[in-house]
Structure formats: structure tokens, C-alpha cells
Interface confidence: low
Amino acid sequence: GCITELLADTCFQGGDITTVFTPSAKHCQLVCTHHPRCLLFTFMAESPSQDPTKWFTCILKDSVTETLPRVNMTGAISGYSFKQCPHQISACNRNVYVDLVMKGMNYNGSIARNVQECQERCTNSVHCHFFTYATSQFPSAEHRNVCLLKYTEMGTPTRITKLSMVVSGFSLKSCALSNLACIRDIFPSTVFADNNIDSVMAPDAFVCRRICTHHPSCLFFTFFSQEWPKESERNLCLLKTSESGLPSTRIKKHKALSGFSLQSCRHSVPVFCHSSFYHNTDFLGEELDIVDVKGHEACQKMCTDAIRCQFFTYSPSPESCHGGKGKCYLKLSSNGSPTKILHGRGGISGYTLRLCKMDNVCTTKIKPRIVGGTASVHGEWPWQITLHTTSPIRRHLCGGSIIGNQWILTAAHCFDQVESPKILRVYSGILNQTEIKKSTSFFGVQKIIIHDQYEEAESGYDIALLKLETAMNYTDAQRPICLPSKGDRNVIYTDCWVTGWGYRRLAGEIQNTLQKANVPLVTTEECQIRYKGHKITNKMICAGYREGGKDACKGDSGGPLSCKHNEVWHLVGITSWGEGCGQRERPGVYTNVVEYLDWILKKTQAV
């Protein structure tokens, strides 16, 4: 089961996989959780009774029984991986560590005003895993205010030592705070000729990219498909890096594909979750168990439920096509990937879904959308909520989007007349307003957070967060939408939809069924021409047709402008304002969410 508490002065005996250095027991737990095999760990804290060379060591452990004997040891802190836990897991660590030096390859040293400036530099430097900053009090004058950016092969320090007047910390790339670009293209018939830092077996280029994305040092990759001429290299995924951060040479070779790590937008792409099935494919690895099950989906479930299982192969028996059972081979390896991939043997293979919780829930696929029509169907926009006010009577006030299990993103102008969060109700998983009865469950609002610079919708900063009184459980009907990535600022979204229960025309009424409209994005320059009397800033985004027609309207405010990119829906805009509704030459104006990522992340992490 899930055990989150740490055990003080306790050491787990045996089961060692590897030893790394971490600045705290909590960070050791994070490293263990993200390691393919680690289930338990022991961390050696700074302690007078311990040899200082052992301080800050984090020993990652595995056990067939999922537990190990406990021994009393002063200064040792032990605990369990979060792999066994149902909750979301993030690799983000915003802490800084005073009087600690984290050792690694120093590749850049420059003057910074303070620790935060140094951390920001690390976050926006492609190679940086962590940093050490020497403050202005540092004894050696030439090192004062120096920010050292560092990397190691595994992303963790090679050693950690005590040193006064320095501060260390980690890159915040995994907190979605990096400005580095995300290159999402996969290039066919391309080999990148650079240093291989590792190689693994993968069934396709997408799995290869995901493996590259969660490997701390991989910046780009080359994948040899199953049709690659050299048999021994088929299904080989080469993880690569270079000094510049970009491939130095591209070679044209058929049956090879190459691409880039998505590390700086990993909060909005699946990195750990490989949910596809690979037909006529066998994954080889260390066998954990063989079970008789009905079908490959049941086999995947068995693997997901078995804590140590990383991947599986289902072998249908000749009778299984008539409803019989087949053999389910549960497997594991040292790195979480198959040791070999074979084709043409009739097996169906795949990966555990247990690691899916390490990805943002917003990246999981939703039901296919109904094309055409203006009325939505159940589960089509599961992040859309209807915000009701109860004063003077209960009515739909605004739309909003689920971005976290306790967070709704909406427009600030929705609260111009709202005195208190007590009168607000959030209804999720709703298609028709008539579904809402007295007995319909809702989420109360604990807190309204309006952007400090908001004055009125038309001048911008029309953004607000609602913190719910209780956390919501995600289902097919209610789940979050991904925030866009800073690294995706230059992406041209082509599949965008505005949704809401708002009026269908200016002098209209709230609609019963959630409406949807496909709208093209309009450039800021184009939009500025249409709104001469207003200042259209880069913090706004416009969408709509020149000829008018499809648009957001009264009652849609605060709702999402959702754009699908690479199979993942992103919250690109928040319905804010416009001249009339669906008027010719008057696009709708939306709050440009990517420009508020820092604000959203700080507010949701701070409260």
C-alpha cells in the first residue's frame, strides 16, 4: 500500500540498487519514485554520529516482498516510493538548500544578484540540472555572487558537502517554469549523429521520445524502426546530447526517425504513460510472473496492479479468440524498458499504466469529439464547469476550466459584482443546465484569487482562480485541461474550440446544453486592426471568423478556448470580452493563458 511518512533513525537492510546524493530525505523519496525499480530508500542525514562522507547519501532499494528489515540507526531516514500511491506525483522541487554545495559538472559560471536569479538561469539553460550560488558573504572574493550551473549524467549531484555562505537548488524545468522551446516534430528518415548517452529498446518513436524526455540528460534522440536494415539495431532508441544542446549533424537515412526531448513542456505531454498495445510484438525481459487471463487488456491491468511489473506480453492461446484465456507474462528490467523486442510471434505487448499518475492527468485521452453540430455531448469537454451564484437566486454566472483537483481557472470580470465566495457553486460534469437540481452535488469555493492588476476585462489581466473547498476526484466527466507550455509560445494552434452555456446572440438567454464552436485564432496585429479603440496586448489572444457568426457571448465568460495539439488539449484562452457577439470583423478577445503561467503556478502552489 501507500506509505508516505518517513521513518526517523531507521535504516532498511539490504536490497540496494544504487546510491545517489540528495539534499534531503524528501528529495531522496522523489528520486526513488522516479527510478524504474526503486520501492524503498534510506537517506543518511547530517548527523554528528555519522561519518560526514556518508551525509546526504540516498540509497535506493528494491525488494520482492516490497519491504525490508528495519534497523535502528541514528541519522538515517527511511521511507517508501510514491509508486504505490494513488495521488499525482510531481518531480518539481522549488526548495533551495542553504550551506550545501551540490557537486556536478560546472559548465557555466556567472554573476547573479540572488539565489532566485541563479535558479531562473538554471531553469532556462538546456543542460542545467542544479546549481550552487555563492552569496555576497562568501569568504573567497572572486567567487562571491557567482552562480554555477551544473549537470551530471543522472541529474543528481555526484556529492553534496557542507559549505557556509552558499545556496544550492534544482532546475525548475519540471515545474513548467522553463522558457526553453519545445520542438514537438518527429523527423522521418533522419539520424542525429551526436553523443549517445544511453540506448534502450522501444516499440515506436513516441515511446522513444517519452523515454528521452524523462531521462535527465537526453536532449534529442534517434529511433531505428523495425524495418531498419541492420537487424541488431531494430527498435533501438538512442538517447543523445550535444554541447550546444542541438544536433550537430542530421543524416538522411530511411527507416530511422529522430526528435527532441520535451523536457520543458513535460507537464503537458505524457512522459511516463505508454498506454498503447503493440500487436504481433513480444517484449523480452526478466520474468516476474505468468498468469492466465482473458485478453491483453486484462493482462495490462495485471501488470499495472503488480507493483514491480514494468511491461508485459500477452500470448493468446489458440482457443482465446473464442473467449478462452491466454498467458500473461509480467516482466521487468533494470531500466524499465524491454531488453529486446521481437516481431511476428503473435504476442500483444504493452507497458504498466501505474506510471501514468506521474504524468499530468490532463494529458490522458478523452472520448473522441462529435464532429459537426453546435451542441456538445457528455464527456466531450470534461474540464468545462458551470459557475453558479446563489444570490439573489441560483443562476449560471460564468464558465471556467478545471486545471487541478482544487483549482478552477476563469475570468476576473465574473466577480465584479460578487462580494464573497460563499455565494458561489462550481458544478462539474454537467452537459445540460436542467441537470442541476437542489440535490445535485457541487463544489463550494474557498477562495477567489483575482489578478492584482485586473481593473476591467478590456484592459487585460482578466484572469482569476477559484480554490475549491474540497478536492475533486477525476472521472471521464470531470478532469483537468493542460495549461500551455512557455516553450510552446510559437505553436500555431489550428484546432480551437470555444465552449459555454452563453447566449446564442446578443439579446438572448443562457442555453440549456453546452454549446461548442470551432474558431480560428487571429494574430494580435490583425485583432488590433479590428479594435482600433483598444490596446490588444500580448497578454490577450483573439479568435473568430472575419465574417462573424461563431463566437463566444454573454454567459460564456471565464470559459475555455481549448486547442488540441499533438493529441493533447490545452487551455489557450479564457473567454474575456468582445464587441457584440459573432459580429463581422469583431473577433472574440480571450486572456492569453501562456502569459500567466508563472502567476497560475505561484498562486496554486503558494496557497
Epitope: 522549488r94 526548495n95 533551495v96 542553504v98 544578484r113 540572488n114 539565489v115 532566485q116 535558479q119 552569496t135 555576497s136 558573504q137 562568501f138 569568504p139 572574493a141 562571491r144 555572487n145 545556496v167 492584482d452 508563472d598 502567476w599 505561484k602
Partner: antibody, heavy 116, light 107 residues
């Protein structure tokens, strides 16, 4: 041990200039930033500006045009100069040493009254 | 410039109580917040820096937490000598700035 001591004129007429000296001991000015902070009677603390170990300066935006901070490392002294004084500049003026961006050692402060 | 707001100018407490003082930054200041104690006629004294690190010699009843824009300073069990004015300060971006102060007084 670490000490900071402010010395100033005590009384200044409106529109005149002010010069306060902060003399430090127990540490070197090349290794530490020094801040100036003031506190009007019965009110809160206001950050005026600072001089970094390497001589760079930063100022409170509202007072930038009237403030100047300099130092003499060899004499272990930091100087705050402020011109065009008004009655609302009446306050206790402190210097303090930088510690991870905060202020770990403070002087006792010197009281300035701006009055005709 | 970053504005630091301490919403309570005064807080009443009794010896042995747990008390929390909040401070809000107008923009993200990461974890760069310090807390000071000032008693009448004395210079301010640094208690906490970088949100949660206690200065040398500061009793462990004083703790700090938060990140981004919302910060909290807590005294787990108030002692008579803790009655004073407490200030928060951001040291993220110059010009650095203080909160308006919270006076902790006897109930």
C-alpha cells in the same frame, strides 16, 4: 565581533541635504552588501537602498532621484547622501548587513529630524 | 516594484498560544522572504530568512513557511518576550521591500 554604527547630523532644515555614515567592524565591506533602512516615528520600516560588496548600488524607486550610496572599503565606511529633505524624511535611519538577501546585523540607528 | 502586505496591523495573543502572521507579495518572490522582530526602542532583529531558515540563536518556536506570494510566520507557543512588532521583507528583487508590520500584543 560584527558591529555597525550610524552617525548623522541629528537636525537638518527642509530642502537641505543629509549625509549619514555607517562605520562597520568585524567584517570586510568587500564581502558584504550594506543596506539603508529608515523608520519614521511610530511607523514601519522602509527600504532605502543598498551597496553590494562589489560597489554596485540599488535604490528605492520612489527616492532614487534624491539618494546616493557610496563606500570606502579601506575605512570600513558606507555613506548615505540624500538631498531636498522634507519634514516627512524625519525618521530613524539604520544601516544593516546583507545576509542571504536579508539583514542579519543592524546598527542602533541615528535619528534625523527635518525641521526649520 | 514588489509590494508586501501584512493584512493584520495588530494581533492579540496570550502566553502559550500558537499565532500565525501572514504576508502577501504583489508578485512571485519564490522563497525569498525574511521576518524581523522589533521591540520598542530597539533595532529590528532577523529571525527567519529564505522563508524557513532560522537565523543563528533564534528559538525553534519561530518558524516560517510559504512560497510564491503567500507567506506565514508562526510562533508555536508565545512567550512574554515575543510581544513585539513583526515585519516581513522580500529579498527576491531589488528594490527590496518590507510589509507594514504586525504588532503582537497581550490579549
Amino acid at each position: 565581533q560584527v558591529q555597525l554604527e550610524e552617525s548623522g547630523p541629528g537636525l537638518v532644515a527642509p530642502s537641505q541635504s543629509l549625509s549619514i555614515t555607517c562605520t562597520v567592524s568585524g567584517f570586510s565591506l568587500t564581502g558584504y552588501g550594506i543596506y539603508w533602512v529608515r523608520q519614521p516615528p511610530g511607523k514601519g520600516l522602509e527600504w532605502l537602498g543598498m551597496i553590494w560588496g562589489d560597489g554596485r548600488t540599488d535604490y528605492n524607486s520612489a527616492l532614487k532621484s534624491r539618494l546616493s550610496i557610496s563606500k570606502d572599503n579601506s575605512k570600513s565606511q558606507v555613506f548615505l547622501k540624500m538631498n531636498s529633505l522634507q519634514t516627512d524624511d524625519t525618521a530613524r535611519y539604520y544601516c544593516a548587513r546583507d545576509y542571504y538577501g536579508s539583514k542579519d546585523y543592524w546598527g542602533q540607528g541615528t535619528t534625523l529630524t527635518v525641521s526649520s | 516594484d514588489i509590494v508586501m502586505t501584512q493584512s493584520h496591523k495588530f494581533m492579540s495573543t496570550s502566553v502559550g498560544d500558537r499565532v500565525s502572521i501572514t504576508c502577501k507579495a504583489s508578485q512571485d518572490v519564490s522563497t525569498a522572504v525574511a521576518w524581523y522582530q522589533q521591540k520598542p526602542g530597539q533595532s529590528p532583529k532577523l529571525l527567519i530568512y529564505l522563508t524557513s531558515y532560522r537565523n543563528t540563536g533564534v528559538p525553534d518556536r519561530f518558524t516560517g513557511s510559504g512560497s510564491g506570494t503567500d507567506f506565514t510566520f508562526t510562533i508555536s507557543s508565545v512567550q512574554a518576550e515575543d510581544l513585539a512588532v513583526y515585519y516581513c521583507q522580500q529579498h527576491y528583487k531589488t528594490p527590496y521591500s518590507f510589509g507594514g508590520g504586525t504588532k503582537l500584543e497581550r490579549l
